[in-house]
Amino acid sequence: YSNFRKSVDSTGRRQYQVQNGPCSYTFLLPETDSCRSSSSPYMSNAVQRDAPLDYDDSVQRLQVLENILENNTQWLMKLENYIQDNMKKEMVEIQQNVVQNQTAVMIEIGTSLLNQTAAQTRKLTDVEAQVLNQTTRLELQLLQHSISTNKLEKQILDQTSEINKLQNKNSFLEQKVLDMEGKHSEQLQSMKEQKDELQVLVSKQSSVIDELEKKLVTATVNNSLLQKQQHDLMETVNSLLTMMSSPNSKSSVAIRKEEQTTFRDCAEIFKSGLTTSGIYTLTFPNSTEEIKAYCDMDVGGGGWTVIQHREDGSVDFQRTWKEYKEGFGSPLGEYWLGNEFVSQLTGQHRYVLKIQLKDWEGNEAHSLYDHFYLAGEESNYRIHLTGLTGTAGKISSISQPGSDFSTKDSDNDKCICKCSQMLSGGWWFDACGPSNLNGQYYPQKQNTNKFNGIKWYYWKGSGYSLKATTMMIRPADF
């Protein structure tokens, strides 16, 4: 006899029992319930959702599903082999004895197996779709990463190129700095040498000045004595004349009772009979204030009041407004007489201005202006010049019309810069103009291409710094 029974075991798995005579066959089928239910975030029989799966999680799940599929396949193969090998005889008997019942059982088993196989195939198809979807996503991400990587690589290359450029520029600048340091050290050494030379020169000059000052004191004393003697002699002569003249005579001889002892300029001194070049004391017009000046009694008939002189660079001409107003330096050497005195003097009578120049090649030239005067301090000692003649250029190197005077602390020029600071010294700067006789003194062989030297453009051109200069004035009617 045979019968067929379907039941559920204690674990909840379905089992099929076939009773055939003394033999009983129990089939335990794998359940689909062991897979995740459709309520899971990953639906077993649905299309992959948009939310990306974690890559590791996908791989793990795929491995699990592959294992299940392999188990099922092995189980089916075992079952098939078992049926083929061990049930041939029984099946013959079953077919003979209970064809109808067994057919039904086998159909149900077959159907169940087919259903399960179909279910597994569907699951596998789903998994394949998920894997394909995930692979596509990963490929897309990989492509994006590749693009990003390319961009980053390009940026890195650009930055590397920029760094190289900067390094090159840095190297160039470093080299430039090194070159400059070398030049500066050379210049510093040269300046030190010049300083030493100048110190020797200064010490020599100091001793010469001391001797000259002693001589000057002696000369002044002698001069005072001479003036006193002259005064006494004049009084004696006057007394004698008075005694000799008739008391009834109406035409008495007119002789100055007192010799002039104050002079406003060197022309007056020359006319008084003192015709030796040297230092004399001048008196401000309408004042008792005195000033020492050098009188040139030799050049062009004499009587010249020297208002500026440069010869060796021993005096610094980069001075303040006050210093240029009052004067500075030594009348025996380099000096500036003073703007205030010259302004007052030239404001009362008509004066001529003579400028004498010497270059480093032994040449001399001069410019003569037939009318010269300085305006007052309220007009910044503006210079007025007319009637140029001479050998130091047909065009005036002092800008026309006249400019205001400027110093390092009083900028009155017509330049966007400060000429006195740029060119050194106080002068009637324009913007800045073709001349500056109060510029920086440069020795021979260092006197060309200078931006701040002693300049008289219309004689020696630009950048040539002169060896010596003298500015002198004299009344036009001398």
């Epitope: 330049c415 966007i416 810069c417 740029m422 913007a431 291409n449 931006f451 300049k455 630009s462 950048g463």
Partner: nanobody, 129 residues
Framework: EVQLVESGGGLVQPGGSLRLSCAAS????????IGWFRQAPGKEREGVSA????????YYADSVKGRFTISSDNSKNTVYLQMNSLRPEDTAVYYC??????????????????????WGQGTLVTVSS
């Protein structure tokens, strides 16, 4: 010490081109204007072209406008004068000269010749067929 050295002069046919260079040392082109001047035999020295502010401002004499171009390379401390369509009347000794850029009269754009205190030795340009 300031030094300016011109180069690039020579003999060229009418309509030809030359490029003059002025290499400066002892100054930086950022702080100075550089001018090109020329002097033909028996004539006064005249301004041709000038440059300042590293090329920000340029000047040309009417006689060379459209034919000459001035430029500078601050890294080389050099100023160039590109001369095209040269004529026989361009024959002269060409000089470059320097002036502190700030030495400029209020309201003016360029500098009188006497403001240029540093000069080169010159380079001869001869335009002849």
């Amino acid at each position: 010490e300031v030094q300016l050295v011109e180069s690039g002069g020579g003999l060229v046919q009418p309509g030809g081109s030359l490029r003059l260079s002025c290499a400066a040392s002892g100054i930086t082109l950022d702080d100075y204007a550089i001018g090109w001047f020329r002097q033909a035999p028996g004539k006064e020295r005249e301004g041709v072209s000038a440059i300042r502010e590293s090329g920000g401002s340029t000047y040309y004499a009417d006689s060379v406008k459209g034919r000459f171009t001035i430029s500078s390379d601050n890294s080389k401390n050099t100023v160039y004068l590109q001369m095209n369509s040269l004529r026989p009347e361009d024959t002269a000794v060409y000089y470059c000269a320097a002036v502190p850029a700030g030495r400029l009269r209020y309201g003016e754009q360029w500098y009188p010749i006497y403001e240029y205190d540093a000069w080169g030795q010159g380079t001869l340009v001869t335009v002849s067929s």
